[in-house]
Interface confidence: low
């Protein structure tokens, strides 16, 4: 018969014949022959292969380097890579999370709209009228100005986006 030019799914073409690919978690030791099946071996510890393959070497699990601010989010198996994430207070610089950078703080006059996660930075927003933030923080939202009226006081000093209002006693004198 004619040698095959294409093979079925989970097979590969070699020496004019179709051989079985190795399953995820295993690497190729030797190709099949007319008389023998493909020979595969499991990946070693700290190694993986995540597809049906003909690789002769397994891939090393990703190392979550603490010097780059990384820690293990999910331990790798023979079929999956280790997933890294960033330490508290840091976020990934890319989707692959190969390194981390410090979460930004929102300056006075700005509050946290969205707290940073392991993959996204802090989102800041300017404090609108009636709100203030007097600190540089990665967590604090804009706080509403104190309501002097509810304390039976009057505004002695107006608030800004960085400072609260200052309340004081009402003038009791009548004209």
């Amino acid at each position: 018969p004619e040698p095959p030019t294409a093979c079925r799914e989970k097979q590969y073409l070699i020496n004019s014949q179709c051989c079985s690919l190795c399953q995820p978690g295993q690497k190729l030791v030797s190709d099949c022959t007319e008389f023998t099946e493909t020979e595969c071996l499991p990946c070693g510890e700290s190694e993986f292969l995540d597809t049906w393959n003909r690789e002769t070497h397994c891939h090393q699990h990703k190392y979550c380097d603490p010097n780059l601010g990384l820690r293990v989010q999910q331990k790798g198996t023979s079929e999956t890579d280790t997933i890294c994430t960033c330490e508290e207070g840091w976020h990934c610089t890319s989707e692959a999370c190969e390194s981390c950078v410090l979460h930004r703080s929102c300056s006075p006059g700005f509050g946290v709209k969205q707290i940073a996660t392991g993959v996204s930075d802090t989102i800041c927003e300017p404090c609108p009228v009636g709100f203030f933030s007097n600190v540089s923080s990665a967590f604090e939202k804009c706080h509403p100005w104190t309501s002097c009226e509810t304390k039976d006081l009057v505004v002695q000093q107006a608030g800004t986006n960085k400072t609260d209002v200052v309340c004081g006693p009402q003038d009791r004198l009548r004209a």
């Epitope: 010097n67 780059l68 330490e87 508290e88 207070g89 610089t93 190969e98 390194s99 410090l102 540089s136």
Partner: antibody, heavy 119, light 112 residues
């Protein structure tokens, strides 16, 4: 090994601009912020700002805002710092320095580029 | 801007003897994640600065263990347990928590 190689010395007239380059090798260029620090003759160190080559974000020292522009060319792993409207007190050695990520300190420095501003 | 003040300005030392440099910041350098973003650099004569200590106490790769950093909040110290001739140069403290990042004025260490 990590290496930062800077362009050669420059002599400029007041009011002119200078563009210093810093070619990085030995690491993934887009993974680390590049900083620029200058040192006037006989003086201490002054941080000018930094750039994240991955996103292109810049962080400038207010003192240089409007006069400095930091850029990168990821295809050649090169960072650039341009300083405009030069004055005599801009005469200094300009260093590029990589920001070590979890270190959050400047872990590798270029050899420095001397910029002399004189009429 | 955060002001970093170093003392002394000049430090004559005897090889084999200990040495200590102080650094004070005008604001706390402690981040909400618990880390203190205070670093020490050494600039040897005619060379670029080099990182010695990062985040208060951590020695950078290849830095001898005779160098140590300590302190908290706003007061910091770099100690050299036994000074060697190769340790001469200008030592700078620096902060990287508040933009603009700033450096101390430097302490010149020289052999007596």
């Amino acid at each position: 090994q990590v290496q930062l190689v800077q362009s050669g010395a420059e002599v400029k007239k007041p009011g002119a601009s200078v563009k210093v380059s810093c070619k990085a090798s030995g690491y993934t260029f887009t993974g680390y912020n590049m900083n620029w620090v200058r040192q006037a003759p006989g003086q201490g160190l002054e941080w000018m700002g930094n750039i994240d080559p991955y996103y292109g974000n810049t962080n400038y020292n207010q003192k240089f805002k409007g006069r400095v522009t930091m850029t990168t060319d990821t295809s050649t792993s090169t960072a650039y710092m341009e300083l405009r409207s030069l004055r005599s007190d801009d005469t200094a050695v300009y260093y590029c320095a990589r920001l070590g990520l979890q270190l959050y300190a400047l872990d590798y420095w270029g050899q420095g580029t001397t910029v002399t501003v004189s009429s | 801007d955060i002001v970093m003040t170093q003392t002394p300005l000049s430090l004559p030392v005897t090889p084999g003897e200990p040495a200590s440099i102080s650094c004070r910041s005008s604001q706390s350098l402690v981040h909400s994640n618990g880390n203190t973003y205070l670093h020490w650099y050494l600039q040897k004569p005619g060379q670029s600065p080099q990182l010695l200590i990062y985040k208060l106490t951590n020695r950078f790769f290849g830095v001898p263990d005779r160098f140590s950093g300590s302190g908290s909040g706003t007061d910091f110290t770099l100690k050299i347990s036994r000074v060697e001739a190769e340790d001469v140069g200008v030592y700078y403290c620096s902060q990287s928590i508040h933009v603009p990042w700033t450096f101390g004025g430097g302490t010149k260490v020289e052999i007596k």
